[in-house]
């Protein structure tokens, strides 16, 4: 084993100095002799010294203890003293205690041995070990007065070689963390939760993120335990974008032929019945009725026109019901109704016409007489000197209950070279021009069409008579959806429950899933904002899709072209999910199709408008929208255009 | 489209008579009356009866019956108003319009001055 | 017969001025009012028939209001093409009548 020079020297010098023990007595002696006893020289004293150092050293002392105690005749005992002790310079020991192994006195000097750790002429300068390579340690190296000791980082334990450092696991103990998973870390440890989560040290506990006070959602934030969701205003046209934070306008993504006609009247605009057109004819001369229009419809049932006085007089009413021509009149109090002629409900355009004869009214369909009925009296009446007529299209100027017969006078139809009286009539054309809304789709097929912009609602009951046997449940509700979306998003059928503002019940077009946050096309069966079953559906093809919804007592089944949906709860949460359900049925519930009321756009996954075509059953009935409590009047009920034919 | 085309302007003496006639186009004729309007220079618009173009019945008001005729003929769709005995106080435009309770369709107007 | 009161007889108004004409009728003809506009040389121009109603062509500056007996024509903001003589006339019974008229001058 090598030491450094300086300690070999400090080992070496004990040694050597036992050699010169004998010869240190015998001067000891030699100087009692000379210069304590008498008075010694300069030379007397390098006499006993045998060199120049020492005697330099100690000669001028020795004056000091003559001057200090007399000379040595005097034979104070004082004076022997102080001189036995010139010669020795470790007494007084010079070196430090603390860091002196041994003090060795020279020739005229001393050296003072230092303790490891120690260093100096005097042995009071603390070495620092840690200066030369850390003193050795791994981590940390502690230097001290003398000596210094190794220590570890927080985390890690030093080892039995007192140098090297060792990583505690912290996740040994199993309180480490609480209930959080905890992973041992060099030097470390984490206590880790769940995305959503964050670890409270306080409580050792995973604790709830709520990403809603970061303000990640641009409209509405919902936070959930370890997630959050946000919502767009769907009744505004809006949707979540790709990164499921901010808002997009829902846009349509299948194009429909929605082009209008400028020379067309679309009789179904109102859908409080009353009429779209109210013509006033007054005449000084006496004028009978002619009227000839071209028609278009799908719809069985409504109110083509109406021509005469007030309710009480003489009038005549021209309908449709179960898609023939029908025609109300009443003459002087007394009132008929006559129906003939053939289904004219096909969608296709046919000439119908209206005259009054001297004692006839002739109705013609493509210029063949369909009905023929005598009268007795005019329908233009004279009053103050002139004659009066009142005209109106697609509605009665009085309620349906004073018909003759009630009938539904909504009617879902197009007219167009229309002819009143055999005058021009440039005040309709120049008022359906500028009035898109007064205008017919150029082309129509069966259905019924959402534009995007409104819903229709009924009142429906849900709950099963006594009277209906042959089964258990006390409830059901069975909903078959023919589509043909031309927008990715929004409600096709849905329950409100108005008490309560809430939606017990919907099924929506969807283009993203909630829980995983991923984009994908689907339809939703949800209750209140459950989620209770989902469906992937290929929404922007153009092309017909059946949804077919069941729930009863204890079942929910999502089916899309005859395929079942994936259930998103558990059987659980369904049986809880469909007692709430059940709990609104018992109430008054309203029945919506293709949009929902102004709810919070929390109450159910989609609130946005449905567009496109669409028919709905419920409980095996057909819903025909002219029998609704209410209609969004750009909703047409028995027409849809057809999809845009793709570019060449 | 509806045109009623009214004869020339007429400057009749006192004591004559005057024939002015309105030829009516674009619809049917008999399906609407005929009115007569007058407007004397400077004054305002008085209705002055209208004839049934079925019937060819006039009605007057009473401030022209007696020297004033209202004629037609279906045959040339033309409707004419006569005016005997003619006054310095005939001395107006006179407008044909089509009957529709009200009038849209109106002739460009005959002026007939009276002046000795 | 039903008489009918047009009042002012003239008024003189600048460009983008509103023009109130009223026309006071001696019955109550419900809403059987009709407004004409005239100018020299030419034949009334119907603006407004039964009912308020404006006729097609017609700007929609021009609009009328009232029923039973009183009734008014206005301009909301007149334009150089307004200046003439305006006319109500009631077909609510025989014999029709016209009111005086109103001449509408540049100030």
């Known amino acids: 084993a090598l030491l450094p020079a300086r300690e070999a020297t400090q080992f070496l010098r004990p040694r050597q100095r036992r050699a010169f023990q004998v010869f240190e007595e015998a001067k000891q002696g030699h100087l009692e002799r000379e210069c304590v006893e008498e008075l010694c020289s300069r030379e007397e004293a390098r006499e006993v010294f045998e060199n120049d150092p020492e005697t330099d050293y100690f000669y001028p002392r020795y004056l000091d203890c003559i001057n200090k105690y007399g000379s040595p005749y005097t034979k104070n005992s004082g004076f022997a003293t102080c001189v036995q002790n010139l010669p020795d310079q470790c007494t007084p020991n010079p070196c430090d205690r603390k860091g002196t192994q041994a003090c060795q006195d020279l020739m005229g000097n001393f050296f003072c041995l230092c303790k490891a750790g120690w260093g100096g002429r005097l042995c009071d300068k603390d070495v620092n070990e840690c200066s030369q390579e850390n003193g050795g340690c791994l981590q940390i190296c502690h230097n001290k007065p003398g000596s210094f000791h190794c220590s570890c980082h927080s985390g890690f334990e030093l080892s039995s070689d007192g140098r090297t450092c060792q990583d505690i696991d912290e996740c040994a103990d199993s309180e480490a963390c609480g209930e959080a998973r905890c992973k041992n870390l060099p030097g470390s440890y984490s206590c880790l939760c769940d995305e959503g989560f964050a670890y409270s040290s306080q409580e050792k506990a995973c604790r709830d993120v709520d990403e809603c006070l970061q303000g990640r959602c641009e409209q509405v934030c919902v936070n959930s335990p370890g997630s959050y969701t946000c919502h767009c205003d769907g009744r505004g046209g809006l949707k979540l974008s790709q990164d499921m934070d901010t808002c997009e306008d829902i846009l349509p993504c299948v194009p429909f032929s929605v082009a209008k006609s400028v020379k067309s009247l679309y009789l179904g605009r109102m859908f409080s019945g009353t009429p779209v057109i109210r013509l006033r004819f007054k005449r000084l001369q006496p004028t009978r009725l002619v009227a000839e229009f071209d028609f278009r419809t799908f719809d069985p049932e409504g109110i083509l026109l109406f021509a005469g006085g007030h309710q009480d007089s003489t009038w005549i009413v021209l309908a449709l019901r179960a898609g023939r021509l029908e025609l109300q009149l009443r003459y002087n109090g007394v009132g008929r109704v006559t129906s003939s002629g053939p289904v004219i409900n096909h969608g296709m355009w046919q000439t119908i016409s209206v005259e009054e004869l001297a004692r006839n009214l002739v109705i013609k369909v493509n210029r063949d007489a369909v009905m023929k009925i005598a009268v007795a009296g005019d329908l233009f009446q004279p009053e103050r000197g002139l004659y009066h007529l009142n005209l109106t299209v697609g509605g009665i100027p009085f309620h349906e209950k004073d018909l003759v017969q009630p009938i539904n006078p909504r009617l879902d139809g197009c007219m167009r070279s229309w002819n009143w009286l055999n005058g021009e009539d440039t005040t309709i054309q120049e008022t359906v021009k500028v009035n898109t809304r007064m205008q017919c789709f150029s082309v129509t097929e069966r259905g019924s069409f959402y534009p995007g912009s409104g819903f229709a609602f009924y009142s429906l009951d849900y709950m099963r008579t006594p009277l209906d046997v042959g089964t258990e449940s006390t409830w059901e509700v069975e909903v078959v959806a023919h589509i043909r979306p031309a927008a990715d998003t929004g409600v096709l059928f849905a329950l409100w429950a108005p008490d309560l503002r809430a939606v017990p019940l919907s099924v929506a077009l969807v283009d993203y899933h909630s829980t995983k946050k991923l984009k994908k096309q689907l339809v939703v069966l949800a209750v209140e904002h459950t989620a209770l079953a989902l469906m992937e559906i290929k929404v922007c093809d153009g092309q017909e899709h059946v949804v077919t919804v069941s729930l009863r007592d204890g079942e929910a089944t999502l089916e899309v072209d005859g395929t079942r949906g994936q259930s998103e709860v558990s059987a659980a949460q369904l049986q809880e999910r469909l007692a709430v359900l059940e709990r609104h049925l018992r109430s008054p519930v309203l029945t919506f199709a293709g949009g929902l009321p102004d709810v919070p756009v929390t109450s159910a996954p989609v609130t946005a408008f449905y567009r496109g075509c669409m028919t709905l059953e419920v409980n095996r009935r057909l819903l025909d929208l002219d029998e609704a409590a209410y209609k969004h009047s750009d909703i047409t009920a028995h027409s849809c255009p057809p999809v845009e034919p793709a570019a060449a | 489209q509806v045109h009623l085309v009214q004869s020339g302007p007429e400057l009749k003496k006192p004591g004559a008579s005057v024939k002015i006639s309105c030829k009516a186009s674009?619809?049917?004729?008999?399906?609407?009356?005929m009115n007569w309007v007058k407007q004397a220079p400077g004054q305002g618009l008085k209705w002055m009866g209208w004839i049934n173009t079925n019937t060819g019945e006039p009605t007057y008001t009473e401030e022209f019956k007696g020297r004033f005729v209202f004629s037609l003929d279906t045959s040339v769709t033309t409707s004419y108003l006569q005016i005997s005995t003619l006054k310095a106080e005939d001395t107006a435009t006179y407008f044909c319009?089509?009957?529709?309770?009200?009038?849209?369709?109106w002739g460009q107007g005959t002026l007939v001055t009276v002046s000795s | 017969e039903t008489t009918l009161t047009q009042s002012p007889s003239s008024l003189s108004v600048s460009t983008g001025d509103r023009v109130t004409i009223t026309c006071i009728t001696s019955?109550?003809?419900?809403?059987?009012m009709n407004w004409y506009q005239q100018k020299p040389g030419k034949p009334p121009k119907l603006l407004i028939s039964e009912g308020n109603t404006l006729r097609p062509g017609v700007p929609s500056r021009f609009s009328s209001s009232g029923s039973g007996t009183d009734f008014t024509l206005t301009i909301s903001s007149t334009q150089p093409e307004d200046f003439a003589d305006y006319y109500c006339l009631q077909t609510d019974s025989v014999p029709l009548t016209f009111g005086q008229g109103t001449k509408v001058e540049i100030k």
């Open positions: 019955t109550d003809i419900d809403d059987d």
């Open positions: 319009a089509r009957d529709e309770g009200w009038f849209v369709y």
């Open positions: 674009g619809y049917t004729f008999t399906n609407y009356g």
